[in-house]
């Protein structure tokens, strides 16, 4: 039969070459002389000449060593022809399988592998995976089957078996308790890959395992006791810098300190922040301290980290004794703003009030007083007693200095400390109205026709306050009532002036006396221009003549 079974040829054969592999034979050779040939890759096409055939005998020849890793199988065709070149058989398939030899060592995909694992983990925790390849066959033989192992570990602390490697997958995992970044931050493992499933050629690489930080160390105060001195009343004053040490990774959340005042700050006088670089706790005053109230504060400060502890850790506490230093404090007027009612127009030298300050300091300091701002110059202040007296006429109706009945004065108190300090107070004099202004009509000039005259309505104003105002009363004096009448309206706030007899065109003085509800009388002269006209007029028609 014109067939041939698959031919297995080991790679790397040592010859001699050409090497006879198998004989092609057609049973047609009984009838005629047969010539054999082969075609295909490895024969007459690239890679040419690897195989040949003895033309007359049919022996298939191998001309050189084979490399399975280059070509693992050759597919050729055998041909049989008669002397005249006629084909006597169909082309026959010839399969040549190159069998593997263990001629390659494993190769790691990297010279150095890097992985990491959190400190303090339990055995079983995966760290990283390493990979080696082997070009040899791993399906039909063990030549390319790689087994992984750890050859050595540096350092060997706390002992030499901290990691293991899965022999087939190359996954490195933790095998021991005791990974401690603060003691060993990095391990270097020499790893091996061995073919023949661990019984063949070996190659090595390095696996570097970084031990990652966990917050397994508490920050500790160093020192734990502090004494500080702070002047009283200072706000935002740096009291003390507290120093901590933490074995965890610097500038990580497991290292950065968080401070908390645990006790001793009943009045919420202090605050503590973390310095972003030094990690120190900066204790400052949130409010001013009062030496006279409490001259010493004992604070208890606890420190933790930004990150939570991964296990139960004792927290460190610092004690800070803060001594409050006495400073000469300014006198304080009591109250800071004093409202006093006083009648306007009181006589000069009349007392207005006593306005004094208290000194927070415990020493019996002498306080002296003076007026700092008195816009109208109406007041004086006794430097020893704080007695305020009138030296000018207090006028409620003075619109330049009085607003809403209130006259505002600033006073100053000075102690005799070294250096002296001053405090200010505000004296608000509420001026009580006195009926010191009579009613005044508006306008005080009128123009009126001498025929069918229109009544002239004048508004009445009084600078005083009720009840020293309306209802008003009007009266004409100095014979003005011969030609004129004056009547106050029902509401009592306007006066109606009427011409009751004919007057020739001229300007006349009308003497009008107005009195308020408190009978304060005010005489006002109204200038009346009488025109030759009927009814309503604003200016006299034609040339004006004086009279």
């Amino acid at each position: 039969d014109w067939v041939v079974a698959p031919i297995s040829v080991p790679e790397n054969g040592k010859g001699p070459f050409p090497q006879r592999l198998n004989q092609l034979k057609s049973n047609k050779d009984r009838d005629t002389k047969i010539f054999y040939s082969i075609t295909g890759p490895g024969a007459d096409s690239p890679p040419e000449g690897v195989f040949a055939v003895e033309k007359e005998t049919g022996w298939l020849l191998l001309n050189k060593p084979l490399d399975r890793e280059e070509i693992a199988k050759y597919e050729l065709f055998g041909h049989a022809v008669s002397e005249n070149g006629a084909s006597v058989e169909d082309p026959m398939n010839i399969s040549i399988i190159v069998t593997d030899q263990n001629d390659h060592k494993p190769k790691f995909t990297q010279d150095t592998f890097r992985g990491s694992v959190l400190e303090g983990v339990l055995p079983g925790t995966s760290v990283m995976q390493v990979t080696a390849t082997d070009e040899d066959d791993a399906i039909y033989t063990y030549n390319g089957v790689v087994a992984y192992s750890i050859h050595s570990q540096e350092p060997k602390d706390p002992h030499d078996l901290m990691f293991t490697i899965h022999r087939s997958t190359g996954t490195i995992s933790v095998i021991s308790s005791g990974l401690d970044r603060e003691k060993v931050p990095e391990y270097t493992l020499t790893i091996q890959a061995t073919d023949m499933d661990g019984d063949g050629s070996t190659t090595t690489a390095v696996a570097v395992v970084e031990i990652l930080d966990a917050n397994d160390n508490a920050p500790m105060f160093d020192p734990q006791k502090y004494e500080a001195h702070v002047p009283e009343n200072a706000v935002g004053h740096e009291v003390q810098r507290l120093t901590v040490t933490d074995l965890d990774a610097p500038n990580s959340p497991a290292w950065r300190a968080t401070y908390l005042i645990m006790g001793g700050d009943d009045g919420d006088h202090f605050t503590i922040t973390t310095h972003p670089e030094s990690n120190q706790g900066i204790l400052t005053t949130r409010k001013g301290l009062d030496f006279e109230a409490k001259n010493q504060h004992t604070l208890y400060v606890e420190v933790t980290n930004e990150a939570p502890f991964v296990l139960k850790l004792p927290t460190s506490t610092a004690t800070i004794v803060v001594h409050v230093e006495d400073v000469n404090e300014a006198p304080v007027f009591v109250p800071p703003s004093k409202v006093v009612e006083v009648q306007e127009g009181i006589p000069t030298g009349e007392p207005v009030c006593v306005y004094t300050a208290e000194d927070p300091d415990k020493e019996n300091q002498k306080i002296s007083y003076r007026i700092l701002r008195d816009p109208a110059g109406w007041l004086a202040m006794d430097p020893d007693s704080g007695q305020v007296t009138a030296v000018g006429t207090l006028d409620r109706e003075d619109e330049q200095f009085v607003r809403n009945n209130i006259y505002e004065v600033m006073v100053l108190a000075m102690d005799n400390g070294s250096p002296p300090t001053t405090g200010t107070g505000t004296l608000l004099l509420t001026l009580i109205d006195v009926n010191d202004h009579g009613p005044v009509p508006e306008p005080r000039q009128i123009t009126i026709c001498n025929q069918s005259p229109v009544r002239q309505v004048l508004n009445i104003t009084d600078k005083d306050l009720s009840p020293h105002t309306s209802p008003f009363q009007a009266q004409l004096t100095d014979d003005s009532d011969i030609y004129w009448t004056a009547e106050v309206n029902e509401e009592g706030d306007t006066v109606v002036l009427s011409l009751k007899k004919f007057l020739k065109q001229d300007t006349y003085d009308v003497h009008l006396s107005l009195s308020d509800h408190g009978n304060k009388e005010q005489l006002t002269v109204i200038r009346a221009t009488v025109c030759d006209c009927h009814g309503h007029v604003e200016t006299c028609p034609g040339p004006w003549k004086g009279g």
Epitope: P123, G124, H166, S168, T169, I175, S177, G178, A214, V310
Partner: antibody, heavy 117, light 111 residues
Framework: EVQLLESGGGLVQPGGSLRLSCAAS????????MSWVRQAPGKGLEWVSA????????YYADSVKGRFAISRDNSKNTLYLQMNSLRAEDTAVYYC??????????WGQGTMVTVSS | QSALTQPASVSGSPGQSITISCTGT?????????VSWYQQHPGKAPKLILS???KRPSGVSNRFSGSKSGNTASLSISGLQAEDEADYYC???????????FGGGTKLTVL
């Protein structure tokens, strides 16, 4: 002498709680991962829970996850197992065991936990 | 159902040798050389007798030896003695949160 001494076992009703302790002496306690291993009457050994030397890492068997909590106090050289929502199948002798690598050595003498109504 | 398979019982006469097998998978026994063996006498705590397949802790008789082939580890006891009668458990390391797998235990009877 290396020694582990369990305590805290006893009779408890289903749904109840119990806290086991294991006092260690004779070795550097904080260098050892610690485990609880139990053995039901007439049965084999069953690993229950483990905790790393620092206490920062814990493991639990699926059968006890969410009900048991392992902890340790290295300053007292003591291991604990807080057992809540106890069931009849939790009845066993509970051993504490130390491990530097992946073998259990030393072992305690065990404490009996009985869950029964 | 235990993760590692052991015969429920084996027996032997004094002076004889016996072997107890412990079969796992390619991810535990087959993957790592971290098989340990424990001896437990009735009413007592387990005691480590072999670690890392074949390493004996100090104080353990050299009659105990261990080996591993593929996914199966074995404990051999030569020159059986009456005090060897006990339960024997194997454990194997495996990666993951159940980092120690236990065998179901083998009861050794010395006839």
């Amino acid at each position: 002498e290396v020694q582990l001494l369990e305590s805290g076992g006893g009779l408890v009703q289903p749904g109840g709680s119990l806290r086991l302790s294991c006092a260690a002496s004779g070795f550097t306690f904080s260098s050892y991962a610690m485990s609880w291993v139990r053995q039901a009457p007439g049965k084999g050994l069953e690993w229950v829970s483990a905790i790393s030397g620092s206490g920062g890492s814990t493991y639990y068997a699926d059968s006890v996850k969410g009900r048991f909590a392992i902890s340790r106090d290295n300053s007292k050289n003591t291991l604990y197992l807080q057992m809540n929502s106890l069931r009849a199948e939790d009845t066993a002798v509970y051993y504490c065991a130390g491990s530097r690598t992946v073998q259990f050595d030393p072992w305690g003498q065990g404490t009996m936990v009985t869950v029964s109504s | 159902q235990s993760a590692l398979t052991q015969p429920a019982s084996v027996s032997g006469s004094p002076g004889q040798s016996i072997t107890i097998s412990c079969t796992g998978t390619s991810n535990d026994v087959g993957a790592y050389n971290y098989v340990s063996w424990y001896q437990q006498h009735p009413g007592k705590a387990p005691k480590l007798i072999l670690s890392e397949v074949n390493k004996r802790p100090s104080g353990v008789s050299n009659r105990f030896s261990g080996s591993k082939s593929g996914n199966t580890a074995s404990l051999s006891i030569s020159g059986l003695q009456a005090e060897d009668e006990a339960d024997y458990y194997c454990t194997s390391y495996t990666m993951g949160s159940t980092f120690m797998l236990f065998g179901g235990g083998t009861k050794l009877t010395v006839l």
